[in-house]
């Protein structure tokens, strides 16, 4: 049986059950190669409390559909008195990066995971030439996820004192020059994740081969190497390589751009101070407030919730968008879709799509940007579920009693973008 998601095959992936202090290793095409789980384990569970390992999915006992992967075992378990076998179940959804498997829940018999990934899309529009896992769990099993930094088009310009060259990088995947052919990037070779531009020439100085690595609690490392054997004539016989060190800052701050810290013989060392390198609990909340123990800021958007069936309305030329954030009030137009953002076609109001659901909510404050994300909306033709990204700006003089109103700014591949100026986005630093 052929591997159902070949682009996920090259790596062993990790997922975590934080509540129970369990680390899962997942290899969907082979075995995880952990001796304690046996030679054919595809899903190996490491219980850090008891320091024990159990195979909860066997690579030989795999069954697959387009969106579901199941690994059975021969180990019996008891579920409501019936004799079942322990198994792992991975549900796949279309995403814009390789993504990460997320632990959902576990019963006595079944370990459930969900994975939003380009590998599950019906069309190849989000697929990279080369992409590597872009997240890590630290020793406390807290997730550090750089997926939000991955550019689907274009690249980051590295801050460098050399006026004659420009070094462009992407994070964890190659630079897509076709979707956004900026004049400088157009000459970059396909597959490169680090492109050096000198005049009208561009050179591949690194491609991703290994996934993201954790080297200290607050430091992540990503390495790119040039795959082709041919040496570049300005590298003094050395093979080019790029090392990017992502540093979680010691306190809240605005985002910075990646900086070149060392260069010799085409070996480039880059340091990027960004809060995306911090653990996810520091950056995100599933509610509309960020003020827990983990975060050192105080943000509360719950006053933006609309009651009594009314919604915010944002005009998007062909469409009207109805928004009801930070609550579970049904939008009237979007009957029973549990939508936080509802897209209605002006010319045919019966054409209604959920552009993100209220129970699929993430509030994120990172590198000075406050963003509310609603995902899991109705599917587009690519298989990607519509989502909405609302970027908030602090405005102490916002209208509508300080609440302000959302403004639609555009759509890219079924992701809808809004900006929202409101006094409730004014971030308060927490007192020490």
């Amino acid at each position: 049986q052929a591997a159902p998601f070949p682009e996920l095959c090259s790596y062993t992936w990790e997922a975590v059950d934080t509540k129970n202090n369990v680390l899962y290793k997942i290899n969907i095409c082979g075995s995880v190669d952990i001796v304690q789980c046996g030679p054919s384990s595809a899903v190996c569970m490491h219980d850090l409390k008891t320091r024990t390992y159990h195979s909860v999915g066997d690579s030989v006992l795999r069954s697959a559909t387009r969106s579901l992967l199941e690994f059975n075992t021969t180990v019996s378990c008891d579920q409501q008195g019936t004799n079942h076998r322990v198994q792992s179940s991975i549900a796949f959804l279309c995403g814009k990066t390789l993504g990460t498997p997320e632990f959902v829940t576990a019963t006595e018999c079944v370990h459930y995971f969900e994975w939003r990934t380009t590998a599950a899309c019906k069309k190849d529009i989000f697929k990279a030439n080369k992409e590597v896992p872009c997240y890590v769990f630290d020793e406390e099993l807290r997730k550090h996820d750089l997926n939000p930094l991955i550019k689907l088009s274009g690249a980051y310009l590295v801050d460098d004192s050399d006026p004659d060259t420009s070094l462009f990088i992407n994070v964890c995947r190659d630079i897509d020059t076709l979707r956004d052919p900026g004049s400088q990037l157009r000459a970059c070779p396909p597959g490169t994740a680090a492109c050096l531009v000198r005049g009208h020439q561009a050179f591949d100085v690194g491609q991703p081969r290994d996934g993201l690595k954790l080297v200290r609690k607050d430091r992540l490392v990503l390495s790119y190497v040039r795959e082709e054997a041919g040496k570049l004539d300005f590298c003094d016989g050395h093979s080019p390589a790029v090392t990017i060190t992502f540093v979680c800052p010691s306190e809240r701050r605005e985002g910075t751009i990646p900086k070149l810290t060392a260069k010799s013989n085409c070996r480039y060392e880059i340091e990027w101070i960004t809060e995306y390198a911090c653990h996810r609990d520091y950056l995100e909340s599933k509610t509309c407030s960020l003020s827990g123990e983990q975060q050192d800021v105080s943000i509360d958007l719950t006053p933006l919730a609309q009651s009594g069936g009314s919604s915010y309305i944002s005009d998007g030329k062909e469409y009207l968008f109805y928004l009801n954030v930070c609550g579970e009030t049904e939008i009237q137009f979007c009957n029973k879709k549990q939508a936080a953002v509802c897209q209605v076609k002006k010319s045919d109001t019966s054409q209604v799509k959920a552009a993100g659901r209220y129970h699929n909510q993430t509030l994120r404050y990172s590198d000075g940007d406050l963003t509310l994300i609603y995902f899991g909306g109705d599917e587009c033709s690519s298989g990607f579920q519509r989502m909405s990204v609302i970027n908030f700006e602090c405005n102490k003089t916002a209208g509508n009693d300080g609440k302000g109103t959302p403004v639609f700014t555009g759509e890219v591949d079924c992701t809808y973008f809004f900006t929202w100026d409101t006094e409730y986005a004014c971030v308060k630093e927490k007192e020490d």
């Epitope: 190669d33 020793e139 993201l212 190497v225």
Partner: nanobody, 124 residues
Framework: QVQLQESGGGLVQAGGSLRLSCAAS????????MGWFRQAPGAEREFVAY????????YYADSVKGRVTISRDNAKNTVYLQINSLKPEDTAVYYC?????????????????WGQGTQVTVSS
């Protein structure tokens, strides 16, 4: 299973060099990430160097950066640690370790296979 056997340790003067070797047998060596750790008497085992299976990622502890190089020869199933400008504080038992798909590269628990160690003593 993977078996690891270190060699190349010994007594050396401060400022000298050593090349430690770690020979692997068993499973396909080229699939494994490799690390070197060391343990001085009465101290915890500490990370020294890491090399990914692909050779694409190397990483060194700050205490040895610039003096140490990790490399591998997949044809010989061997990983090496070249240590230059040795200091008395480099005295320790040096361990070679292997693991599959290592993410936390300085964490001992992520390496599932360990050698017995080779003693390095640096005299002043």
């Amino acid at each position: 299973q993977v078996q690891l056997q270190e060699s190349g340790g010994g007594l050396v003067q401060a400022g000298g060099s050593l090349r430690l070797s770690c020979a692997a047998s068993g499973r396909t060596f080229s699939n494994y990430d490799m690390g070197w750790f060391r343990q001085a008497p009465g101290a915890e085992r500490e990370f020294v160097a890491y090399l990914s299976w692909s050779g694409g990622t190397t990483y060194y502890a700050d205490s040895v950066k610039g003096r140490v190089t990790i490399s591998r020869d997949n044809a010989k199933n061997t990983v090496y640690l070249q240590i230059n400008s040795l200091k008395p504080e480099d005295t320790a038992v040096y361990y070679c370790a292997a693991g599959s798909a290592i993410v936390r590269i300085t964490t001992t628990r992520d390496y599932h296979y360990w050698g017995q160690g080779t003693q390095v003593t640096v005299s002043s």
